[in-house]
Amino acid sequence: MRTEAQVPALQPPEPGLEGAMGHRTLVLPWVLLTLCVTAGTPEVWVQVRMEATELSSFTIRCGFLGSGSISLVTVSWGGPNGAGGTTLAVLHPERGIRQWAPARQARWETQSSISLILEGSGASSPCANTTFCCKFASFPEGSWEACGSLPPSSDPGLSAPPTPAPILRADLAGILGVSGVLLFGCVYLLHLLRRHKHRPAPRLQPSRTSPQAPRARAWAPSQASQAALHVPYATINTSCRPATLDTAHPHGGPSWWASLPTHAAHRPQGPAAWASTPIPARGSFVSVENGLYAQAGERPPHTGPGLTLFPDPRGPRAMEGPLGVR
């Protein structure tokens, strides 16, 4: 799903070859064409590993290969977040980490990857065919989610290879925003080029681009948007899903966690601008005016009321007590 297409060596015409007006109209197409060719969709990878030491203990690692700043990561099991999945952990880059049993330990590994260790015993322990999903909310792409599970015959200590986004899913924030502009730009570009073709023009230095230059990938965002809106989720065997989790706030974490709807990844404008969102039916999308988007799905049975989030004015270090110490 990652589409970092190589930009063909396009050569804009030399300024002296056309009048000022003509030059200006030709600059935009080159810019747009570059955008069209390089436009890509982010990719999320998920790796699930059963620990050799504790046979029912799992490590889930997830990473985001997009270009934006991550504003929230949600790890769930039993299906995608908001589509029947149960939230295991939520990681916020400035407010710390919140986790629910049987999650034992969620951590950032790098700025764009996280890991989660799951407890191996008890009624809510995972089993080999459990599906784990990671959802990354980022600015400006929106939310991207991928799911993975252990291969059926996994040996302990072995891991499933990282799975790049088996569930194609991107929220309208990224798709309709960026992709819409790019799609419009690309169409406009074609229109300009076609118009330019039919108009007698001075001879331009031919571009060195081969006719086989990678064009197909330029349309990835619009393909993604169509797929995201039409591809149904995979049916997931949920025989190992836990009972509803009633340990919603085991560490008495700060109030913002209590008010964080665990079904949705809210994308803040900046590090501290949060918003709560109404919750329509599963699979629908909510767009909020000033660039705040949230993928909306059904509220899992264990979540509290969807209250508005207020950032802690003291910043992340104020969170240490409840979040850091177990």
Epitope: L65, S69, P93, W108, Q111, S112, G324
Partner: antibody
Amino acid sequence: EVQLQQSGAELVKPGASVKLSCTASGFNIKDIYMHWLKQRPEQGLEWIGRVDPTNGNSEYDPRFQGKATLTADTSSNIAYLQLSSLTSEDTAVYYCARFGIYPYFDYWGQGTTLTVSS
Amino acid sequence: SIVMTQTPKFLLVSAGDRVTITCKASQSVNKAVVWYQQKPGQSPKLLINYASNRYTGVPDRFTGSGYGTDFTFSISTVQAEDLAVYFCQQDYSSPWTFGGGTKLEIK
């Protein structure tokens, strides 16, 4: 209050080994990765590696493989950096820094000065 | 490993000046770049993460930008207390690497 308290300055002879400590307070080291960094006088920072206190797994910059050994004792909330076969090139300030609750080094130790001299 | 080339090495400026430091990665690191400030005799302190996000409590005269391989860090109006060494760092892939540092001195 979150703190990373590092052991005191060390003066050791070439060829010897040394073990530096980083005592964490205000949080559980199982919740983070402990990273170690090296800074030579008037030079940049070099990443030595990181240890996962949960399982003792460690990862190193290839330049420090064989030179450094990272360990952690979760019962006492202490991370360790052991350096072996010391030479004058190892003279530097060594820092521990935590990463994991947030996706960046939000807390650093005060640094331990290691001087290797005969 | 990814090499982070930071320029310039030294900056001698007057209070009130604007300064810009650049960091170039040897390969794309997306936005996984952090900027630190290290004052004399102290440990480094985080200023910017994700290439452009100002850390809590960091004055807004400090800004970062960039994506891929080219990153910049600016101080819009230098103040006397900004005397320090500034480092960029990538954590896109292991081993994590730092720029060589820029020593900012005030005239």
